[in-house]
């Protein structure tokens, strides 16, 4: 029953004279495992015999013996699966039918597998992608039908004859489906590839040479060109005449069209592959190419840079920058359109030609006021030199410089006197805007840089105004100098430095505490009458009738001022004391009587003492000594003493006479 | 005030050399130019050599090559070196100042010396 024979191989193995060959195969016997397997080469079924005929190349018996002369062919298969064949070395005449004879305890089956040995080792076959573009990675295959383990081979990739670079990555199968050698190369042709050689070639373990196979490369590619100028270095004066040729070294397809371009940009009715300019203008200046299209598309030529040389155009100057503040820097670029670049450059300012400066740029570390004006430039090449341009304005803007604070008034300048100052200065850039005083205070500004100060104190000192613009510069303070009378004049007593007694040695002190002028005159006045005319009033021993209100005054040339009053206070002891007697000192008894005891002290007295005729001291002790009723006993003279911090005083005696009255007499 | 005093002329044999000096003081401007004018007998003053602030130097062409001038800050000295001297360069050398640019009439120059005769002869 042949349907359990199920077997699995490659159809045709393919080897050469003194190779091998290496069949992978597998089979399934359904029924049992194998008992008798014959390798026969080229068999013929024999109908009468029933068995096949043919070279045995191999035979099992059930023994598992296997002949000596078999040694040559292997069966490396087993008994239910398995039924790889290796031949080694194999032979031209064992081309043809390999026949596999397989019996079972039951079944048996004969299959049949193709051998292909030549004579010498067959080239491999080397496989292009249908179109190769230049630049564009392609991959190359070259493919052999052999492969064996005994028997190495190599497959090495030549370019004209010349081992490629690139590495190829090499791969073998030897499966039931497929029995090859490969090789992949990855390549990116160039142009300069198209039409060459490529081959690959079979060698031997040793690298001996065993076979080849070989193609041409057909690199599609856009035009390669080569670009000829007359003048060789594209270098003409205005005027002059340029031919350009362009030569195609190499298209694939062939070309179509030709044009030519000028700074990349196509240039109109130029379509022949020469170019023709005639009385080149400096506009002419730029980068030539030709460019040529194919099917793959177009290809342009290097560039050819065609120097059109003029001498200097009217030159421009730029600033960098302007308006520059004073101190910063400054840099002048003289700009002038000349083929070759100019070599040397001529400078103005305002006019004059600037000497030693020669160069493109002017750089000004430290830019200072006189640095403001016109600058402009000539520039100068080989060809001749150019004009000067309408050239550019440098503004250096710096503060207000040499500001003054200027009093405007005659003087001297007297303390109430309106004082105007003005603030002037000598040049500013740009134009002063506003002003600025020191003090501040509530002074009008009449107009823009005077000041109008009312009624001026005579502590209005120094004043400084600044200038401003985009800065403010502060002037040197200006001294008004203004001119008072003398100022808080005050009387100060210098001595006794404690309280005044009676005739103690006195001094006053007439001070004050500015003057302006600094001359001055003392007056000193008491009740309206001169004392003196010196800083100081001096009594040698005071006396209480010094006392009183005392001013002093201090006078300059602009006027006069006069101190507080004030009090000079004289402490003495109780004086001029006296004993009043009210009614009178003669008094009818009964009535009342009063005496009183007066007297000048200071301070006041504040402790009296009475006596009588007898010096006995009477138990009385305040200013007034009050009887009633009077009685006749107290006929007689009294006297009293007074006390103050000072000391005691005592009065003469006054003598009180009392009376009968006219009831006494008539009793009598 | 400014002040410059020249210094270092003379008569000298054709092709021979010679330094003058001029002393600057009371100079107190920031940005100046210095320079050697000549003044040959029945002529008129012409520009020699000068030498700005920041160093920057031009000689007149019948010079280049032959004279070279100098300034020594720390001295507030100017020097002009002349090499292979010429009948032709036989005239009074003078120094001169002025605040700003370097310019080539003498009539921009504010500040003068009292010059220097330089005579050579062949």
């Known amino acids: 029953d042949s349907s359990k024979w199920v077997f699995e191989h490659p159809e045709t193995l393919y080897a050469w004279e003194g190779a091998c060959v290496w069949i992978p195969c597998t089979y399934r016997a359904l029924d049992g495992d194998l008992e008798s397997f014959i390798l026969f080469h080229n068999p013929e079924y024999n109908k009468n015999t029933s068995k096949f005929d043919g070279t045995r190349l191999y035979e099992s018996t059930k023994d598992g013996k296997v002949p000596s002369e078999q040694k040559r062919v292997q069966f490396l298969g087993d008994k239910n699966k398995n039924c790889t064949l290796s031949i080694h070395p194999v032979h031209l005449n064992d081309s043809g039918q390999l026949g596999l004879r397989m019996e079972s305890k039951t079944e048996k089956w004969m299959e049949r597998i193709h051998l292909n040995v030549s004579e010498r080792p067959f080239p491999p076959h080397i496989q292009l992608p249908p179109e190769i573009q230049e630049s564009q990675e392609v991959t190359l295959t070259c493919l052999l039908n052999f492969s064996c383990y005994g028997y190495p081979i190599q497959l090495q990739w030549l370019l004209e004859g010349v081992p490629m670079r690139q590495a190829a990555v090499t791969s073998t199968s030897l499966t039931i489906k497929s029995v090859f050698t490969r090789s992949e190369l990855k390549f990116s042709p160039q142009w300069s590839h198209h039409g060459k050689i490529v081959t690959c070639q079979l060698q031997d373990a040793d690298g001996k040479f065993l076979s080849n196979d070989t193609v041409q490369l057909n690199v599609k590619h856009t035009p390669k060109l080569e670009i000829k100028v007359t003048p060789s270095d594209a270098i003409v004066r205005e005027g002059d005449s340029v031919t350009m040729t362009c030569e195609v070294s190499s298209s694939n397809p062939e070309y179509t069209t030709v044009s030519w371009l000028k700074d990349g940009t196509s240039l109109k009715k130029q379509n022949t592959f020469t170019l023709n300019l005639r009385e080149v203008t400096k506009d002419q200046s730029g980068k030539y190419c030709c460019q040529v299209s194919n099917d793959v598309g177009p290809g342009r030529s290097e560039e050819v840079f065609l120097q059109v040389q003029y001498a200097p155009e009217p030159s421009t100057v730029q600033i960098l920058h302007s308006p520059a503040v004073e101190g910063s820097q400054v840099e002048f670029l003289c700009m002038s359109l000349a083929n070759p670049l100019p070599t040397n450059y001529t400078w103005y300012h305002n006019g004059k030609e600037m000497q030693g400066r020669t160069e493109e740029k002017v750089h000004i570390p430290k830019i200072l006021p006189w640095h403001a004006g016109t600058y402009s430039c000539v520039a100068e090449n080989i060809l001749g030199t150019g004009q000067r341009g309408p050239g550019a304005e440098l503004d250096v803007q710096y503060p207000p410089k040499k500001v003054t604070t200027v009093i405007q008034n005659p003087m001297p300048i007297r303390e109430g006197d309106t004082v105007t100052l003005s603030c002037n200065y000598n040049s500013s850039n740009p134009s002063v805007t506003r002003y600025e005083w020191k003090p501040h205070g509530a002074w009008e500004e009449p107009s823009l840089g005077v000041l109008k100060i009312q009624n001026v104190g005579w502590d209005n000192t120094t004043i400084a105004c600044a200038a401003c613009n985009s800065w403010c510069s502060w002037a040197s303070p200006v001294a008004l100098n203004v001119q008072y009378a003398p100022r808080d004049v005050r009387v100060r007593k210098i001595k006794p430095l404690s309280e005044i007694h009676s005739g103690n040695s006195v001094s006053l002190q007439c001070d004050f505490s500015s003057s302006h002028p600094k001359e001055v005159q003392f007056f000193w006045e008491k009740n309206g009458r001169l004392l003196g005319k010196e800083s100081q009033l001096n009594f040698d021993s005071i006396s209480p009738e010094d006392a009183g209100s005392y001013s002093c005054w201090v006078n300059n040339s602009i006027g006069q001022t006069a101190s507080k009053a004030w009090t000079l206070e004289v402490l003495y002891a109780p004086r001029r004391l006296r004993v009043s007697m009210s009614p009178g000192d003669q008094v009818m008894e009964g009535k009342s009587a009063t005496l009183t005891c007066e007297s000048d002290a200071n301070p006041p007295v504040s402790h009296y003492t009475w006596f009588d005729w007898n010096n006995q001291s009477l138990p009385y002790h305040s200013q007034k000594l009050r009887l009633e009723p009077v009685k006749v006993q107290h006929s007689g003279a009294y006297w009293c003493q007074g006390t103050n911090s000072v000391g005691k005083g005592r009065s003469p005696l006054s003598t009180l006479t009392v009376y009968y009255s006219p009831e006494t007499i008539g009793r009598r | 005030e400014v002040q410059l005093v020249e210094s270092g002329g003379g008569s000298v044999q054709s092709g021979g050399s010679l330094r003058l000096s001029c002393a600057a003081s009371g100079y107190t401007y920031r940005g100046y130019c210095l320079a050697w004018f000549r003044q040959a007998p029945g002529k008129e003053r012409e520009r020699v050599a000068t030498i700005d602030s920041d160093g920057y130097i031009s000689y007149a062409d019948s010079v280049k090559g032959r004279f070279t001038i100098s300034q020594d800050n720390t001295k507030n000295t100017l020097y002009l070196e002349m090499n292979t001297l010429k009948p032709e360069d036989t005239a009074m050398y003078y120094c001169?100042?002025?605040?700003?640019?370097?310019?080539?009439?003498?009539?921009?120059?504010?500040?003068w010396g009292q010059g220097t005769q330089v005579t050579v002869s062949s």
């Open positions: 001169a100042a002025r605040g700003g640019w370097c310019y080539s009439l003498s009539k921009e120059y504010n500040y």
